[in-house]
Interface confidence: low
């Protein structure tokens, strides 16, 4: 039976059969190539996910700007890393310097992604409304050569901005753009070009689905570890590996290693070989004490005996991934080269207080 004759791909996705030799037990018998603007194994997801400005998945170091406004005797810096949608506080947005005649703010997504839209918001300073009334969007694959999004007349498209300091305005692009760098250029502003924003889009390959830790589809017995910490040495108060599920709640809601050292690990058995494209980590709290993994390495295997550490493609050595800063935030790291594996191990390198992990693996 030709599996593609019933086209399992949604939204116009192209179904292609995969030969038995290539397939092994890594892939299903077909793959969907999605049209621009759609993602997921079956192109079922409309590509309008927030890319991480508001929730912090986009780090401060990924946000840059042409200039910064400094106010209030030099104490207030309206820096680009503040330009996150719905950010609160007295100084809570980006504003360029008043003498910047070509202001811009840029996000480096660290990898190529589909970008399908932008959500903008103004802010207030000394009770006055400040916001972008109009702006242009440029994008780039390398951070040097930028293309502007064009309108039907082949002119740089001018997007409609905001009308007050707090209202959120969504602009979706007519055609998704493939980009690593996205720049917003304010062209008309009220009082000052003050901005909070979010980018919308999705992963390029669509293979970044949660693999089942958070939703419990990976059973407890498939999550193991080098050791587990017991509060007061009591089994009743164990921080078991099976607790290492993203956003798990309760008094004992994470895996905590039983000893201190770089030989500790947490292992997930995915049940069968899968394409793993990323990981989301989270710390935890132990009776008020904040604990998290500050950095880690990743190892993978198909037999649980022979392990390979994920390599940094640029250096050829084991990649150390940046981890968490606190006990609750999500830190998402995507692999430049996907892993094909059944078993995945997290190898903590640095930590705060104890080695504590909640996580989700991403892939398909």
């Amino acid at each position: 039976l030709d599996i593609c004759s019933k086209n399992p791909c949604h939204n116009g996705g192209l179904c292609e059969e995969i030969s038995q030799e290539v397939r092994g037990d890594v892939f299903p018998s077909y793959t969907c190539t999605c049209l621009k603007g759609y993602a997921g194994n079956h192109c079922e997801t409309k590509c309008v996910e927030p890319l991480g400005l508001e929730n912090g998945n986009i780090a401060n170091s990924q946000i840059a700007a042409s200039s910064v406004r400094v106010t209030f005797l030099g104490l207030q810096h309206w820096v680009p890393e503040l330009a996150r949608l719905n950010r609160a506080g007295m100084v809570n947005a980006w504003t360029p310097s008043s003498n910047d005649d070509n202001p811009w703010i840029q996000v480096n997504l660290l990898r190529r992604m589909w970008v399908t839209g932008v959500v903008t918001q103004g802010a207030s300073r000394l009770a006055s409304h400040e916001y972008l009334k109009a702006f242009k969007v440029a994008y780039s694959l390398n951070g040097h050569e930028f293309d502007f999004i064009h309108d039907v007349n082949k002119k740089h498209k001018e997007f409609v901005g905001n009308w007050n300091k707090n209202a959120v305005h969504v602009n979706l692009f007519e055609t998704p753009v493939e980009a690593q760098y996205v720049r917003l250029y304010p062209t008309s502003c009220h009082t000052a070009c003050t901005l909070r924003f979010e980018l919308l889009g999705c992963e390029l390959n669509g293979c970044a689905n949660p693999l089942g830790l958070k939703n419990n589809s990976i059973p407890d017995k498939q999550i193991t570890a080098s050791s587990s910490y017991k509060t007061w040495g009591l089994h009743l108060f164990s921080w078991n590996p099976s607790y290492a599920r993203l956003d798990k709640q309760g008094n004992f809601n994470a895996w905590v290693a039983g000893s201190y050292g770089n030989d500790q690990w947490l292992q997930v058995d995915l049940g069968s070989s899968k394409e793993v494209t990323g990981i989301i980590t989270q710390g935890a709290r132990n009776f008020g004490s904040v604990q998290f993994v500050a950095s880690y390495k990743v190892a993978y295997s198909n037999d649980s005996a022979n392990w390979t550490e994920y390599q940094d493609p640029r250096t050829g050595s084991s990649k150390i991934f940046p981890g968490n800063w606190d006990n609750h935030s999500h830190k998402k790291n995507l692999f430049e080269t996907p892993i094909l594996a059944r078993y995945v191990r997290i190898l903590p390198v640095a930590w705060h207080n104890r080695i504590a992990l909640r996580l989700e693996l991403l892939g398909c």
Epitope: Y260, N262, G288
Partner: antibody, heavy 125, light 107 residues
């Protein structure tokens, strides 16, 4: 024995860049669990944590100063560097570096167990 | 950020006295507390870590206690060389924060 020593310019003007060096001996920053922390103390005031660098080159900054701080290390030379830019008169202080060490894992805790003697920096126009 | 408060900014005591310095955290810090001594010349030393553990080389007349939000440093019998400013510091969560210090003087 463990020693740390801070060095850097004693006087700067506002908007300039301050680069401080912490030279240490008696330990290696490639040792798992260790790190170096920068702390400052304005004259007659309390201590303020600025930044820390772990043995694996992971870094953490005080959020209120993060946009102006950069911490780096040269493990082979036993040195850690802190850059503050641009400086302002409010950055006038004595700057200390200290070793971050890890204690018994069961406590899951670390402290600054050895400190430098401090270097005084004045920012004045 | 967690605020650390040392309500007594200066304290005067006689040689041989038992002296207690207190520190309060704005939230529960689960014993993740250190005490440091700063001599008039500026040198800083670790005395106590994890609320009650004596750092190596520190005289046994120093001790620490407390839990939750309230902690104290005790010198069982004050010596002249103990004249210094004492700081508490929480390590429960980043950013690390310090108390404003308690200056100890001899009567």
């Amino acid at each position: 024995q463990v020693t740390l020593k801070e060095s850097g310019p004693t006087v700067l003007k506002p908007t300039q860049t301050l680069t401080l060096t912490c030279s240490f001996s008696g330990f290696s920053l490639s040792t798992s669990g260790l790190g170096v922390i920068w702390i400052r103390q304005p004259s007659g005031a309390g201590l303020e944590w600025l930044a820390q660098i772990y043995w694996d080159d992971n870094k953490r900054y005080n959020p209120s100063l993060k946009s102006r701080l950069t911490i780096t290390k040269d493990t082979s030379k036993n040195q850690v560097f802190l850059t503050i830019t641009p400086v302002d008169t409010a950055d006038t202080a004595t700057y200390y570096c200290a070793r971050r060490t890890f204690y018994d894992y069961d406590e899951g805790f670390y402290a600054m167990d050895y400190w430098g003697q401090g270097t005084t920096v004045t920012v004045s126009s | 950020d967690i605020q650390m408060t040392q309500t007594t900014s200066s304290l005067s005591a006689s040689v041989g006295d038992r002296v207690t310095i207190t520190c309060r955290a704005s939230q529960d810090i689960s014993n993740y507390l250190n005490w440091y001594q700063q001599k008039p010349g500026g040198a800083i030393k670790l005395l106590i870590y994890y609320a009650s553990r004596l750092h190596s080389g520190v005289p046994s007349r120093f001790s620490g206690s407390g839990s939750g939000t309230d902690y104290s440093l005790t010198i069982s019998s004050l010596e002249p060389e103990d004249i210094a400013t004492y700081f508490c510091q929480q390590g429960n969560t980043l950013p690390l924060t310090f108390g404003q210090g308690t200056k100890l003087e001899i009567k």
